[in-house]
């Protein structure tokens, strides 16, 4: 469970993928579409709002903590809409809502190498925010062999 | 466990310029997720904030100082330093540094902060 | 800016009671962003409740926060010994951060 219902603390940032795509949001028929792609130089990178909440949780070796807890975030790129899992469909998904926010919205921070975090799925432990066919998904990552995948590492730059 | 500590000059003349560095030391300062800043609390006063700083360089100020503030970071060191130009009796205090949760506001566009781990504080006095 | 009001500005109480501070804002907050501080003689501030009702890291649970839009309460429900201390609130809601002037919670 989440500690408050208060984030601890919010950063700006760009999301990009380990091969340094980035991930956009356009609005498009009254809701957004979230792409991944090459941008051009001159082309200004969207930012994310990410809030870390506090879990009761201990965090793991690889879980971001604070005070030895773990830490989660939720994502969003413009007001009132949230990065979202859709367990159902493996899909990530933008939504409009009001806080408290549903579980959907909230991915454990993982601290990886180079500079490198990954998004797991609060509600579906293991699954986690990725790339696939130019487009964010949810993928199943099995612990023993994984967790370094490229495919669910993005960088996140100011 | 995270410590910060500062550290400067005690004595200040009127119209010089007040230095003081922030050491943090148990984390380290490029944190994504925090924020650093400084507080003052003059004798016997409430506290007022100064301004805080992100570790890539990103500073937001006070508007009452902002005029005679700077705040800068230098990683390298895991440090944070404050410096407040053409100061007068009034800026008399206790200068506290801290770690700060920083939240956005959509509306304004803009951060605002809490402090969530202090420094012990250094007192700096202006007189000639 | 937004203006935080808090009262009393003393508070007269004997250890084992219930102290119950209150901060009023000028403006009201859409969020819950409200942080409470303790500060004894000589010492830093101490984060006791960020977001209004969060209690920080290490804080025991006699002490409690409440409230929204303008009107924010903290309450420590039974006063210990090492509790009497000067309590300030804070906005972080819109920038400039700003503080209340401080309730004063002493020995009767």
């Known amino acids: 469970s989440i500690t408050g219902i208060s984030p601890i603390t919010e950063s700006l940032a760009s999301l990009s993928t380990y091969n340094d795509q980035s991930i956009t949001f356009a609005l498009e028929d009254e809701s957004y579409e979230i792409y991944v792609e090459d941008l051009k130089k001159d082309k200004k990178k969207d930012k994310v709002l990410l809030s870390y909440y506090e879990s009761q949780h201990p965090s793991s070796e690889s879980g971001d903590g604070v005070d030895g807890k773990m830490l989660m975030v939720t994502l969003s790129p413009t007001k009132d809409f949230w990065l979202q899992a859709n367990n159902k469909e493996h899909s990530v998904e933008l939504h409009k809502c009001e806080k408290p926010l549903p579980d959907q919205a909230f991915f454990v921070l993982h601290n990886r190498s180079f500079n490198c975090v990954s998004f797991e799925c609060k509600t579906d432990p293991g699954v986690f925010i990725g790339v696939k066919d130019n487009h964010l998904a949810l993928i199943k990552v099995d612990y023993s062999e994984n967790l370094g995948s490229e495919n669910i590492l993005f960088k996140l730059s100011e | 466990e995270l410590q910060l500590q500062e550290s400067g000059p005690g004595l200040v003349k009127p119209s010089e310029t007040l230095s003081l560095t922030c050491t943090v030391s148990?984390?380290?300062?490029?944190?994504?997720?925090?924020?650093w800043g400084w507080i003052r609390q003059p004798p016997g006063k409430g506290l007022e904030w100064i301004g805080s700083?992100?570790?890539?360089?990103?500073?937001y100020y006070n508007p009452s100082l902002k005029s005679r503030v700077t705040i800068s970071v230098d990683t390298s060191k895991n440090q944070f330093s404050l410096m407040l130009t053409s100061v007068t009796a009034a800026d008399t205090a206790v200068y506290y540094c801290?770690?700060?949760?920083?939240?956005?506001?959509?509306?304004?566009?803009?951060?605002?902060?809490?402090?969530?781990?202090w420094g012990q504080g250094t007192t700096v006095t202006v007189s000639s | 800016e937004i203006v935080l009001t808090q009262s009393p500005g003393t508070l007269s109480l004997s250890p084992g009671e219930r102290a119950t501070l209150s901060c009023r804002a000028s403006?009201?907050?859409?969020?819950?962003?409200l942080a409470w501080y303790q500060q004894k003689p000589g010492q830093a501030p101490r984060l006791l409740i960020y977001?209004?009702?969060s209690r920080a890291t290490g804080i025991p649970d006699r002490f409690s926060g409440s409230g929204s839009g303008t009107d924010f309460t903290l309450t420590i429900s039974r006063l210990e010994p090492e509790d009497f201390a000067v309590y300030y609130c804070?906005?972080?809601?819109?920038?400039?951060?700003?503080f209340g002037g401080g309730t004063k919670v002493e020995i009767k």
């Open positions: 700083i992100y570790y890539s360089g990103r500073t």
């Open positions: 801290a770690r700060a949760g920083g939240l956005y506001n959509w509306n304004d566009e803009s951060f605002s902060f809490y402090m969530d781990v």
């Open positions: 148990g984390g380290s300062i490029r944190s994504s997720i925090f924020y």
């Open positions: 977001g209004a009702s």
């Open positions: 403006q009201s907050f859409s969020s819950s962003y």
């Open positions: 804070q906005q972080y809601d819109r920038s400039p951060l700003t």
